[in-house]
Amino acid sequence: FERTRSLQDPCSNCPAGTFCDNNRNQICSPCPPNSFSSAGGQRTCDICRQCKGVFRTRKECSSTSNAECDCTPGFHCLGAGCSMCEQDCKQGQELTKKGCKDCCFGTFNDQKRGICRPWTNCSLDGKSVLVNGTKERDVVCGPSPADLSPGASSVTPPAPAREPGHSPQ
């Protein structure tokens, strides 16, 4: 089948890094500078991605593969193949249309990205607050108030702080 196909279509013999040049009687020509073809049998080469502005070149373009970008310090990648760069904020902040803003009271963000999330409500689990929350850290829940009353036979060890979920990007 491959042999039959190549007899019918001479372009199928053109390897990655080349294109089938219709202007030159379907000869396989190398991709011009700043272009690539990642598969054989291509009739054109694709333009290489340019990493400019906040985008930095992580991998140079070659004749067979596109350039790959990441983001300059102070920014992080979003989207497939780092299609976007989004600004970092400090812990205790979230990014808004107005730039980085401090988390409101009762919320926290322990990362440089994502949104401020509400402190854990310890009382929902029948527990008390062992360590107060901050803009950067969730509260730490401790034993229930009943466990701390005089004469209680045993004290439950403090529950570990919950692992904060990552906000969807």
């Epitope: 502005g53 906040v54 979003l78 989207g79 299609s83 976007m84 760069c85 989004e86 600004q87 990014l95 808004t96 249309k97 969807p168 990007q169």
Partner: nanobody
Amino acid sequence: EVQLVESGGGLVQPGGSLRLSCGASGFTFSSYWMLWFRQAPGKELEWVANVNQDGSENYYVDSVEGRFTISRDNAKNSLYLQMHSLRAEDTAVYYCARGGEDYGNSHFGMDVWGQGTMVTVSS
């Protein structure tokens, strides 16, 4: 090809004014948030201002509030940054950038950047 090209940078004295332009091509300009960033020598890239699709909503970093004005002309596919009362600390390369699809709702990422224009404030 999607492209942003800045112009209008130059040398200006402290207290002076300058207007930067950013010409857009290869996409429907009026469908996107647009932003200005700057990078001072030896510093990280800093957000300066942004404007929504029709120009009715805009925001500024505190250090330029009241001195800089971001605007756009969708008929001309152009973004502008009018800068007044310029200070030495405004010296930087200024970049325009396009907010990605759904900017301001699900994310605040930028997907297209210009090459930058240099602004030097010095006496």
